[in-house]
Interface confidence: medium
């Protein structure tokens, strides 16, 4: 543990002014594991002036950082890049004349205390004013800055010309597209200072590439995957003062696939379980021994779980007998295609056959027949390729 500091398994505190520390505290290689440190408290360290880029990176579990009544003048831009758990930062009564929001933009801070620093009135600190105004909590900090006349101005009254929040405008409010297709989003940003723009695509699976100048940009998404349905895409404008974003939700339409169809199981009712994927929601039709199965209160389709574009359910049968033994075919259809699967179901032995076996249906079998082509007008089985979803038409969404 550095001189003038005390260390425990989870905490470092340096409050002894003599001899004091001149650099951010670092642990010896064989001492406490820095990853377990959750709090660093530093006070009365007049010679501590800088936090360098690599000073804090080892403390990945750090949640609370306090440096008060010290000589802190400069914080490197990427000082907290690795400290994603940081929640509370207190830099009260230091020598900070400026502080960039870039230090903190990736952090989800619940508290940033900056009282008692000799900030210079400039656009560089306008983000702090904006942050304060956004918080609108009763315990707003009393922050000041020094103007050209070395006069203390309340930050709340600070007016800097050509220094405001940027704006982002994404041209694609309705983003519905068919799987396998491509789209291009356009975004324009504006503001003074002129903002940079970037795309936030989260965990988008589909291949994407962007072309971005300062105020104009496009994002091209190709061979769109159905896994990206429901995801959000944002265009972000960022300058010294803050950021703005405009977002769209991606809806991907694709043809149905029956991903699961199994032999009947008995619980409260008999159930032929199935899982169907498709968007928009596919229409389901059952066939029994090749003929349309007219559902009733005794035999009906039930969807038990819907997971975005995936539907888990049963063909539910009340007290089926040997008369219900046979081939059951499920067809799922939407406007992008259809899929078909079949199983043979055996509920009960035929009367007079002791072992319960039906010679016509010796074992329950599972067969994947792909997609029946002609009864719905398909010439290919689209759903066994990359499914192309929906209940309408490939290029328009009809739900």
């Amino acid at each position: 543990c550095p001189t003038s500091c005390k260390c425990s398994a989870s905490r470092i505190w340096c409050s002894d002014p003599s001899p004091g520390i001149v650099a951010f505290p670092r642990l010896e290689p064989n001492s406490v594991d820095p990853e377990n440190i959750t709090e660093i408290f530093i006070a009365n360290q007049k010679r501590l002036e800088i936090i360098n880029e690599d000073d804090v990176e080892a403390y990945v579990g750090l949640r609370n950082l306090t440096i008060v009544d010290s000589g802190l003048k400069f914080v490197a831009h990427k000082a907290f890049l690795k400290n994603s758990n940081l929640q509370h930062i207190n830099f009260t009564r230091n020598k900070l004349t400026s502080l960039s929001r870039k230090h903190f933009r990736h952090l989800d801070l619940s508290e940033l205390i900056l009282v008692g620093n000799p900030f210079t009135c400039s656009c560089d600190i306008m983000w702090i004013k904006t942050l304060q105004e956004a918080k609108s909590s009763p315990d707003t900090q009393d922050l000041y800055c020094l103007n050209e006349s070395s006069k203390n101005i309340p930050l709340a009254n600070l007016q800097i010309p050509n220094c405001g929040l940027p704006s982002a405008n994404l041209a694609a409010p309705n983003l519905t597209v068919e799987e396998g297709k491509s789209i291009t989003l356009s975004c324009s940003v504006a503001g003074d200072p002129v903002p940079n723009m970037y795309w936030d695509v989260g965990n988008l699976v589909s291949k994407h590439m962007n072309e971005t100048s300062h105020t104009q940009g496009s994002l091209r998404i190709t061979n769109i995957s159905s896994d990206d349905s429901g995801k959000q895409i944002s265009c972000v404008a960022e300058n010294l003062v803050g950021e703005d974003q405009d977002s769209v939700n991606l809806t991907v339409h694709f043809a149905p696939t029956i991903t699961f169809l199994e032999s009947p199981t008995s619980d409260h009712h008999w159930c032929i379980p199935f899982t169907v994927k498709g968007n928009p929601k596919p229409a389901l039709q059952w066939f029994y021994n090749g003929a349309i199965l007219n559902e009733s209160k005794y035999i009906c389709t039930k969807i038990h779980v819907t997971n975005h574009t995936e539907y888990h359910g049963c063909l539910q049968l009340d007290n089926p007998t040997h008369m219900n033994n046979g081939d059951y075919t499920l067809i799922a259809k939407n406007e992008y295609g259809k899929d078909e699967k079949q199983i043979s179901a055996h509920f009960m032995g035929w009367p007079g056959i002791d072992d319960g076996a039906n010679p016509n249906y010796p074992d329950v079998i599972y067969e994947d027949y792909g997609t029946a082509a002609n009864d719905i007008g398909d010439t290919t089985n689209r759903s066994n390729e990359i499914p192309s979803t929906d209940v309408t038409d490939k290029t328009g969404r009809e739900h």
Partner: antibody
């Protein structure tokens, strides 16, 4: 600007074969379905089917299944409608129409190809 | 035959309001699928007038409006003009096994 340009009018005899075309321009051709629509003289619009120019996936209306074939050549941004054996009842105006990506309806239509089948 | 039924004709004087209905079933409009409307002036290709029940493409005058309720949809022309004389067709997706897309039977609008 988006355009669908269809081939010119045809006069054929029953039993003959025919292929008419629809060429797209002004947009990414493989990104949109092309639909074929028939209009017999003095009658309404009938949906014949559609083709995805990207992979030549097709759907046919049951009324037209087996009588016509759709095909696509994405290198030339062209889709085709063909008959192997025309009948007098095939006399009609045939339209190709593009389905809008991300919205409903057929937003662009070809000018139509008039096919006359007469002995 | 079409699964979407429209009245064969409607007429009105200039400035009047006319409504065209499009009646479907539980496998198309009644299942929640969107309705599109097309205008076909004599001798020309059809033109998209309303998409997704209520949306007008750019360039379509605001006197044309669409609505949908249950298994039916309607196209309304308020302030009928001479150039509105044309055939009008509705269209929807049909989820029945034998269907894909269907146009309505068509309605001839005459401006008196």
């Amino acid at each position: 600007q988006v355009q669908l340009v269809q081939s010119g009018a045809e006069v054929k005899k029953p039993g003959e074969s025919l292929r008419i075309s629809c060429k797209g321009s002004g947009y990414s051709f493989t990104n949109n379905w092309i639909n074929w629509v028939r209009q017999m003289p003095g009658k309404g619009l009938e949906w014949m089917g559609r083709i995805d120019p990207d992979d030549s996936y097709t759907n046919y209306s049951p009324s037209f299944q087996g009588h016509v074939i759709f095909s696509a050549d994405k290198s030339s941004n062209t889709v085709y409608l063909q008959w192997s054996s025309l009948e007098a009842s095939d006399t009609a105006m045939y339209y190709c129409a593009r389905r809008a990506q991300g919205g409903g309806g057929y937003d662009y239509w070809g000018q139509g190809t008039l096919v006359t089948v007469s002995s | 035959q079409s699964v979407l039924t429209q009245p064969p004709s409607v007429s009105g004087a200039p400035g009047q309001r006319v409504t065209i209905s499009c009646t479907g079933s539980s496998s198309n409009i009644g299942a929640g699928f969107n309705v599109h409307w097309y205008q076909q002036v004599a001798g020309l290709a059809p033109k998209l007038l309303i998409h997704d029940n209520i949306n007008r493409p750019s360039g379509v005058p605001d006197r044309f409006s669409g609505s949908k309720s249950g298994a039916s949809a309607s196209l309304t022309i308020t302030g009928l003009q001479a150039e509105d004389e044309a055939d009008y067709y509705c269209q929807s997706y049909d989820s029945s096994l034998s269907g894909w897309f269907a146009f309505g039977t068509g309605t001839k609008v005459t401006v008196l």
